[in-house]
């Protein structure tokens, strides 16, 4: 057969479907690769074809589409099942072609099963909310094309095992799942069980996904630096190590790029040509508020480093804060010669 | 001193994932450094792939998201980046480098490796 | 995105000129912005970070000054191993951004 332009294997679309449940794959060529659309495709003479390399097997197979109940179907660019089995893992092509014009790509399908509390290896989405916002919603994902418009389905909402029926803050309504005021105690796995009848037959749709309830932009501010501080001064002789922690407490922020660093005169520590390590922590609240630790050390620290000035710095996407550690030389304790004189006897 | 040196192979196809490593020497990845991936296009400018930090935080240029991955391997003391669905505007040179939090800049970089996507 | 211009695109000097390069941006970044000098073949190379300050190893006729928008790269006496591109990079929002470049070549 002449050439075809084959853009491999798209590992980009890792697609991964419950067993025993409705799916539908779009054919990705039209999504990725090529600039026109399937209908333009179609008016143009070309035709989509279809076939699969079964899991663990090298020989491309046509999809058998004759299966009874039109198990497996294809409708415009979209492969159909009505529903999935655990053997219908495998590398999925769709192909475009005529008698002058070829072009195709593969893509991954994984039929993954669950348990009865909808565990499974599938990878879950996650939806962050802000603890204590009003009211935040959550959507069934991934349903639509499934059912037209005229199909009113039932929606059955869980949360981890427990279907979710007068709960305190969370509610169902349909598609959605509202959270009235999101608490640490809402974090979990959410699961929505769409059932929606076609030709006579009752089909489920499951998806899952983890709600995180995070730190509220309201109560979001710029960096606060604990340490150094005015209360604590690092006070050394010459020889001695010299650590001064900077401790930094960042608000969760969506996306934001937590920094702490430290100055040494005005320079990068690299940049000062003394013996400098710099040691970091970091440790997250439940809401996913962050501290940082900075330790600066300088094992044998001399006069010279003693009269340098150190400065944590510290930003976030709510600002920038810096501050200076109080670094000074111990000074000696004097040394008291004491004298006993006893020689003021009478004679 | 911290050297950076880029591995990988120098011919992807398209629509195949660009996978690089960069080895970490005289330093460790767990210092508090961003390790990041910035890429020249042959006879152009230089462009901000994205970075992670020493503890597994990443950022990506929004332009690449979609398509990125920066992860750390620390028993190897080396970072990596994927680069999936390629095609020929992928074709640069990628750099790893060093970068220093706040506006300490890129001070430790790779010597670079060409990536062309062809079939 | 910050959008970094600079200009000149393209400048001849000669050895023992001073010449200044100019990196301006979209909005304001404070002082979070680096140059970097790259030779044909090479990696860039780190000559000044926030705005002003000399990298470690760079020669002092280096010199680099602004903030906000506004930032200047100056070459106090032009050595022959400073003809090269010279390019601004901003730090300050994601994505991070360089500026286009500006050739810098022997008159």
């Known amino acids: 057969s002449e050439r075809c332009d084959d853009w491999g294997l798209d590992t980009m679309r890792q697609i991964q479907v419950f067993e025993d449940e409705p799916a539908r794959i779009k054919c990705p060529l039209f999504e990725h690769f090529l600039k026109f659309n399937y209908s333009t495709a179609h008016s143009a003479g070309l035709t989509l074809i279809w076939y699969w390399t079964r899991q663990d097997r090298d020989l491309e197979e046509p999809i058998n589409f004759r299966l009874p109940e039109n198990r497996i179907s294809k409708e415009k660019d979209v492969l159909w099942f009505r529903p999935t089995l655990l053997n219908d893992t495998g590398n999925y092509t769709c192909m475009l072609r005529n008698t002058t014009y070829c072009s195709k790509v593969a893509f991954p399908l994984e039929v993954v099963q669950k348990d009865s509390c909808f565990n499974s290896p599938m990878k879950l989405p996650v939806h962050k909310l802000y603890i204590e916002y009003g009211i935040q919603r959550i959507t069934c994902p991934n349903v639509d094309g499934y059912f037209p418009s005229s199909v009113k389905p039932t929606i059955t909402w869980y949360m981890g095992c427990y279907k979710i029926q007068n709960f305190n803050n969370v509610i169902p309504e349909g598609m959605n799942l509202s959270f009235l005021i999101a608490l640490i105690s809402n974090n979990g796995n959410y699961t929505c069980v769409v059932t929606y009848p076609e030709n006579g037959r009752t089909f489920h749709l499951t998806r899952t996904l983890t709600v995180k309830v995070v730190g509220s932009p309201k109560n979001a501010v710029p960096p606060v630096i604990h340490s150094p501080n005015d209360h604590v001064v690092y006070e050394k002789e010459p020889g001695e190590e010299l650590l001064i922690p900077c401790t930094v407490y960042f608000s969760f922020l969506m996306d934001s790029r937590n920094e702490v660093w430290w100055t040494i005169d005005g320079k990068k520590p690299d940049d000062i040509t003394i013996d400098v390590t710099i040691n970091e922590s970091i440790s997250h609240s439940r809401t996913e508020d962050e501290t940082r630790t900075q330790i600066l050390s300088i094992k044998k620290v001399t006069s010279e480093d003693l009269k340098r000035s150190y400065v944590c710095h510290a930003r976030s996407a709510k600002g920038e804060v810096a501050k200076a550690a109080k670094v000074k030389q111990k000074v000696p304790a004097p040394r008291y010669t004491v004298e006993l004189a006893c020689g003021f006897g009478a004679t | 001193q911290v050297q950076l040196q880029e591995s990988g192979p120098g011919l992807v196809k398209p629509l195949g994932t660009l996978s690089l490593t960069c080895a970490v020497s005289?330093?460790?990845?767990?210092?508090?450094?961003?390790w990041s991936w910035v890429r020249q296009p042959p006879g152009k400018g230089l462009e901000w792939i994205g970075e992670?930090?020493?503890?597994?935080?990443?950022n990506y240029n929004p332009s690449l998201k979609s398509r990125v991955t920066i992860a750390l391997d620390w028993s190897k003391n080396q970072f990596s980046l994927q680069l999936r669905s390629v095609t020929a505007a992928d074709t640069a040179v990628y750099y790893c480098?060093?970068?220093?939090?706040?506006?300490?800049?890129?001070?430790?970089w790779g010597q670079g490796t060409l990536v062309t996507v062809s079939s | 995105d910050i959008q970094l211009t600079q200009s000149p695109s393209f400048l001849s000097a000669s050895v023992g000129d001073r010449v200044t390069i100019s990196c301006r941006a979209s909005?304001?970044?404070?002082?979070?912005l680096a140059w970097y000098q790259q030779k044909p073949g090479k990696a860039p190379k780190l000559l000044i970070y926030?705005?002003?300050t000399l990298q470690g190893g760079v020669p002092s006729r280096f010199s680099g000054s602004g903030s906000g928008t506004t930032f200047t790269l100056t070459i106090s006496s032009l050595q022959p191993e400073d003809f090269a591109t010279y390019y601004c990079?901003?730090?300050?929002?994601?994505?991070?951004?360089f500026g286009p470049g500006t050739k810098l070549e022997i008159k």
């Open positions: 909005q304001g970044i404070s002082s979070y």
């Open positions: 005289g330093g460790s990845i767990s210092n508090s450094n961003w």
């Open positions: 480098a060093r970068y220093g939090s706040g506006p300490f800049g890129g001070d430790c």
């Open positions: 990079q901003q730090l300050n929002t994601y994505p991070f951004t």
């Open positions: 926030a705005a002003s």
């Open positions: 992670i930090y020493h503890s597994g935080s990443t």
